[in-house]
């Protein structure tokens, strides 16, 4: 990996764990939403998500544990909150998000999300 090779996977995993820890703390501390129907705040293994409004796209900054974060810090990862108040899932039922803007190789162009 061109730029990111200087950062070890071990180091990235440690940063990811710290990101997760901070996220889980914020999930418990943030006030609850005003409405009854909403997508629950969550850590989906990639990013930390606030409560979502049904039928909307939610975006958060690319996670800071990425080795190339300095290149993508002003970009966003997107997640869709379905009309039923459930986060949209991937084809195998896995948590889904469009992280194409956060990929190391991206130079501003958008690509299709994971199949």
């Amino acid at each position: 990996r061109p730029q990111g090779a200087t950062v070890s996977l071990w180091e990235t995993v440690q940063k990811w764990r710290e990101y997760r820890r901070q996220c889980q703390r914020s999930l418990t501390e943030d006030p609850p939403p005003a409405t009854d129907l909403f997508c629950n705040r969550t850590f989906d293994e990639y990013a930390c998500w606030p409560d979502g409004e049904p039928g909307s796209f939610v975006n958060v900054s690319c996670p800071w544990y990425l080795p190339w974060h300095h290149k993508v810090q002003h970009r966003f990862v997107f997640k869709r909150c379905g009309p039923d108040g459930q986060w949209v899932r991937g084809p195998r039922g896995q948590p889904w998000r469009d992280a194409s803007e956060c990929e190391e190789s991206k130079r501003g162009e958008r690509s299709s999300p994971e199949e």
Epitope: G4, T12, V13, W16, E45, Y46, A47, Y65, L66, P67, V77, R89, G90, P91, R92, G93, Q94, R97, A99, C102, E103, E104, E114, E115
Partner: antibody, heavy 128, light 107 residues
């Protein structure tokens, strides 16, 4: 060695319930997705349900939704299938099978590796 | 749901013949496909994973190829123990779906 052993099958009347179990050994059960697959007499294979890790990700084939419930007890290395409101068309050999996945923290992608180890099966017959 | 169309449903061959079985997916599934062998009264056994990788312990006469929507299982020289039923399985999307099966019979 890696082993999956199903139990709990039998003959049951339509509308009644049955619970199947799948005892796993020889691998880290909590690190695998676990599936149920069935095969009606003389027919092909049909996927029934899957459950990953702690149960946050479960899914079912349409024909059993609302009637069957997949669950697991990682402390007992055991997978379950609770089958309610059984129908004649549920008659089949039921197999459990495992699946490994891999999550890449750099891309956010989940990679799935398919069903690699299967149990020997347990027979469920729904008949009046 | 993704439909897996497997052909032929049955075929006859002689020991030593080359046998080819095909599975077609109703939409692209990358290489998320396995091939399984099932002997009467037994559980399926995986032969090929990721469309073309040979499962450990499986004889090298079995091979798989394809990606996207078209997949093939080939037995280069059929042996007596190979005259059983074969299934493909896609694990790209829920619900997972199997092909209808191919019964390989002795000519």
């Amino acid at each position: 060695q890696v082993q999956l052993v199903e139990s709990g099958g039998g003959v049951v009347q339509p509308g009644r319930s049955l619970r199947l179990s799948c005892a796993a050994s020889g691998f880290t059960f909590s690190s695998y997705g676990m599936h149920w697959v069935r095969q009606a007499p003389g027919k092909g294979l049909e996927w029934v349900a899957v459950m990953w890790y702690d149960g946050s990700n479960k899914d079912y084939v349409d024909s059993v939704k609302g009637r069957f419930t997949i669950s697991r007890d990682n402390s007992k290395n055991t997978l379950y299938l609770q089958m309610n409101r059984l129908r004649a068309e549920d008659t089949a050999v039921y197999y459990c099978a495992r699946e490994k996945d891999h999550y890449d923290i750099l891309t956010g992608y989940n990679y799935y590796y398919g069903l690699d180890v299967w149990g020997q099966g347990t027979t469920v017959t729904v008949s009046s | 749901d993704i439909q897996m169309t497997q052909s032929p449903s049955s075929l006859s061959a002689s020991v030593g013949d080359r046998v080819t079985i095909t599975c077609r997916a109703s939409q692209g599934i990358r290489n998320d496909l396995g091939w399984y062998q099932q002997k009467p009264g037994k559980a399926p056994k995986r032969l090929i994973y990721a469309a073309s990788s040979l499962q450990s312990g499986v004889p090298s006469r079995f091979s798989g190829s394809g990606s996207g929507t078209e997949f093939t299982l080939t037995i280069s020289s059929v042996q007596p123990e190979d005259f059983v039923t074969y299934y493909c399985l896609q694990h790209n999307s829920n619900p997972l779906t199997f092909g209808g099966g191919t019964k390989v019979e002795i000519k």
